[in-house]
């Protein structure tokens, strides 16, 4: 007996599709070997029609696919547009030849079934509305009209013109005439459910002179669309339920045997398992919406359904769309930290992987917000201005060719805790979710800047020093001037570098930066940080105010600016780097649910570049002592 298993017989009708699942023993060899579907000939030869190696025969061109699902130890052969010529004996199997392990499958394709001559076939999806048309002769214009459903030999009345409605069709069936028409009546049945399927008879009049019409109603369950995604990648469910439910609450649910558990809906419900990694985006006024899930996990695999109902919950007889999501564990997306921890006043460096083939793509970092549908406004990007409230403390460092970029956020407060997304305008699968957890600091920060009240005077020499502990001895220390398009590294002088690492003196490890002579454009945020090659570590920030020699009042109270860096108060009192109003448009490119929107954000950021650049490191002159 063969260890391969599948349906022994499959029957269908012309024009239909079949999906044949073949099961194989769960071994590494079986998972990776060739899968095939062949047709058994009279001569005993089995002619390959489709295989997992990419072979597709002429007669299956454009109408068949073979998909391997190694995590289920199954493969599926989908064949569409069946004809009676497809009737025959087939094998589904594994191996380099068609003589390997296989299972015999018999496929029978019949003609579309014949109904009584005047039968009209209505095919509708679950939740939709059918309008059954019933013709009658003038002699029955004033007679009773009715629609009944055949149950064996009996025909049970669904609705009639005396206003009788079968309880199971209550509020769903209406009988009506249109305009001045004297020879047709109509029956609408809405919110169709599977048990509505069957043969109906509509009738005008009684006895032998009655006019009768037959209607065959087929109510189709939604055929799930198969989605095959990699672990840690993202998936977008595009849901188009039609205009009739445009004003109803929308939902996405995950099928769990009998029930369908809501993952997200437009009424604010969200499954905690998807916290921080889901967005629901309305697409238009016609009821279209999409749901994006990032950071896919193995347990996300399963059957999903989107729908609409005023309750925001699945309801029988309302339109739905279905998918089956498979999550491939052999992922190209690297495993990165999903939780990053920081302390108040400190900093975090978050590494964001991206598709290395797309090093020129625009990179972004956004903050997932748990409003009713979830949203992710961009905080920083390679060509996007830093969001208000993040000036001086957020920068994106692109490392072309490395397949990753780094986002640094310093002067942390507990309000920074939450979920953040790394994304690009390229390969949409490469979206990663990071949860940032900020705890109250219990000790002094590793990096400390002196003087803390940094006010420089134009034309003079100004030096600031950054004290670092011995644990950073071997790392590269740097100073950079923060601007809206990053933090530009400046020349600096490492005083600790002269000592041997063996006799490291905690008190004398200093990296200093000198502005000589100080210019007005030197005013702004400066960062002191440590890094090892492309790997960024701790940073601290200080605001340097610049004043005229003659005047005593600086542009901004430096104590206030740097107090934020040290004590991290909740309110923001920054006036520096104020931009023109037109630049604020690109700070919230709503929901990054598809590439189009990301692209727009990038384009817009590029437009704003010229007017939005709040200065660069070009005006700096650092000198070594």
């Amino acid at each position: 007996q063969s260890p391969i298993f599948g349906p022994q017989d499959v029957s269908s009708i012309e024009g239909n599709s079949v999906s044949i699942t073949c099961y194989y023993p769960d071994t590494s060899v079986n998972r990776h070997t060739r899968k095939y579907w062949c047709r058994q000939g009279a001569n005993g030869y089995c002619a390959t029609l489709i295989s997992s190696n990419g072979y597709l025969s002429k007669e299956y061109s454009g109408r068949a696919s073979l998909i391997n699902f190694p995590e289920n130890s199954t493969f599926v052969i989908n064949i569409a547009h069946l004809t009676q010529e497809d009737t025959g004996s087939y094998k589904c199997g594994l191996g380099t030849t068609n003589r390997g392990l296989f299972f015999d499958v018999s496929l029978e394709v019949s003609q579309v079934p014949e109904f009584p001559n005047d039968t009209h076939v209505y095919t509708k999806d679950i939740g939709r509305t059918v309008t059954i048309e019933c013709r009658f002769k003038e002699g029955n214009a004033h007679s009773k009209k009715s629609l009944c459903k055949k149950r064996g030999e009996a025909c049970e009345v669904v609705i009639d013109s005396t206003e009788y409605v079968d309880p199971s069709y209550k509020d769903r069936a209406i009988l009506f005439m249109k305009g001045t028409s004297r020879d047709i009546f109509y029956v609408n049945i809405s919110h169709l459910i599977p048990s509505d399927a069957g043969l109906y008879v509509c009738q005008a009049g009684e006895g032998p002179s009655a006019d009768k019409n037959n209607a065959d109603l087929q109510v189709l369950e939604p055929e799930p669309e198969l989605l095959y995604k990699d672990l840690r990648s993202s998936v977008t469910f595009e849901c188009d339920l039609g205009r009739e439910v445009a004003n109803d609450a929308k939902y996405l649910c995950r099928k769990n045997k009998e029930t369908c558990d809501v993952i997200i809906n437009t009424l604010g419900k969200r499954d905690p398992a998807f916290e921080g990694r889901i967005l629901l985006t309305p697409r238009d006024d016609n009821g279209r919406f999409s749901v994006l899930i990032t950071g896919l996990r193995k347990e996300d695999a399963g059957h999903y359904q989107c729908g609409a109902h005023s309750s925001g919950l699945p309801q029988e007889g309302w339109p739905v769309q279905a998918w089956q999501l498979f999550v491939n564990e052999e992922s190209t997306i690297p495993n990165s930290r999903s939780v990053v921890k920081g302390v108040t006043g400190g900093s975090v460096a978050i590494v964001c992987p991206y598709n290395p083939k797309e090093s020129s793509s625009l990179k972004y970092w956004c903050h997932w917000e748990a409003d009713e549908n979830g949203r992710c406004p961009v905080l920083v990007g390679t060509q996007a201005l830093v969001q208000e409230g993040y000036e001086g403390r957020l920068a994106l460092f692109d490392q072309p060719g490395s397949g990753a970029y780094t986002v640094i956020l310093n002067q942390l407060t507990t309000q920074d805790s939450g979920f953040y997304w790394c994304l690009t305008d390229g390969d949409s699968r490469w979206r990663t979710t990071i949860e940032l957890q900020v705890a109250e600091a219990t000790k002094k920060p590793d990096l400390e800047v002196t003087p803390q009240n940094a006010t420089a005077v134009i034309g003079e020499t100004f030096t600031i020093s950054c004290h670092y502990p011995c644990k950073f001895y071997s790392q590269e220390k740097y100073w950079c001037k923060w601007s809206n398009d990053g933090c530009h590294i400046l020349p600096s002088h490492d005083e600790g570098a002269r000592q041997s690492s063996v006799s490291c003196d905690q008190s004398s490890q200093i990296v200093s930066m000198t502005l000589n002579p100080v210019k007005k454009e030197d005013e702004g945020w400066y960062w002191c940080g440590v890094k090892e090659g492309q790997v960024y570590g701790e940073t601290t920030a200080i605001y340097v105010a610049v004043e005229e020699r003659t005047r005593g009042s600086p542009h901004i109270n430096p104590t206030d600016a740097n107090a934020r860096a040290k004590d991290a108060p909740e309110e923001e009192a920054m006036e520096s780097s104020v931009r023109e109003d037109e630049n604020k448009a690109n700070l919230d490119p709503r929901l990054f649910a598809d590439e189009r929107e990301i692209q727009n954000a990038g384009d817009q950021a590029q437009e704003n570049r010229a007017s939005g650049n709040a200065g660069s490191a070009g005006g700096q002159s650092g000198s070594s002592k």
């Epitope: 298993f5 349906p7 022994q8 017989d9 499959v10 029957s11 269908s12 009708i13 239909n16 599709s17 079949v18 044949i20 099961y23 289920n72 199954t74 019949s110 579309v112 079934p113 095919t123 599977p194 048990s195 399927a197 087929q218 109510v219 189709l220 369950e221 055929e223 099928k255 769990n256 045997k257 009998e258 059957h303 089956q324």
Partner: nanobody, 128 residues
Framework: EVQLVESGGGLVQAGGSLRLSCAAS????????VGWFRQAPGKEREFVAH???????????YYGDFVKGRFTISRGTAKNTVYLQMNSLKPEDTAVYYC??????????????????WGQGTLVTVSS
């Protein structure tokens, strides 16, 4: 609540035939798949046959290895009934036959874990 009721079991001579019925009742029964299993005294429950249909005239029929063309699973015109026609019966077919249905989508139809509703079973005895 969904209920599955088997009928049609009984005593039959080797080489004879029986037709088992499985009738489903309950408002929430909307399964598009039904399986038959059997359990002989002192043995594990084993897969006999499974039928899965789509609303568009497409049906998939699965059978256990031992069936070898002797049994046929089918669906009644009343969509809540499934039959198992058993021909050329052998003494080793003696067992309690159970019908089962899943609540939703199903993985491997041979696995008892995939089914949520079970009938009480009907006894088939094949004498030699």
């Amino acid at each position: 609540e969904v209920q599955l009721v088997e009928s049609g079991g009984g005593l039959v001579q080797a080489g004879g035939s029986l037709r088992l019925s499985c009738a489903a009742s309950g408002r929430t029964f909307s399964s598009d798949a039904v399986g038959w299993f059997r359990q002989a005294p002192g043995k594990e429950r084993e897969f006999v046959a499974h039928i899965h249909w789509s609303g568009d005239f497409t049906t998939y029929y699965y059978y256990g290895d031992f069936v070898k063309g002797r049994f046929t699973i089918s669906r009644g015109t009343a969509k809540n009934t499934v039959y198992l026609q058993m021909n050329s019966l052998k003494p080793e077919d003696t067992a309690v036959y159970y019908c089962a249905a899943p609540k939703g989508a199903i993985g491997d139809p041979r696995s008892t874990r995939e089914y949520d509703y079970w009938g009480q079973g009907t006894l088939v005895t094949v004498s030699s």
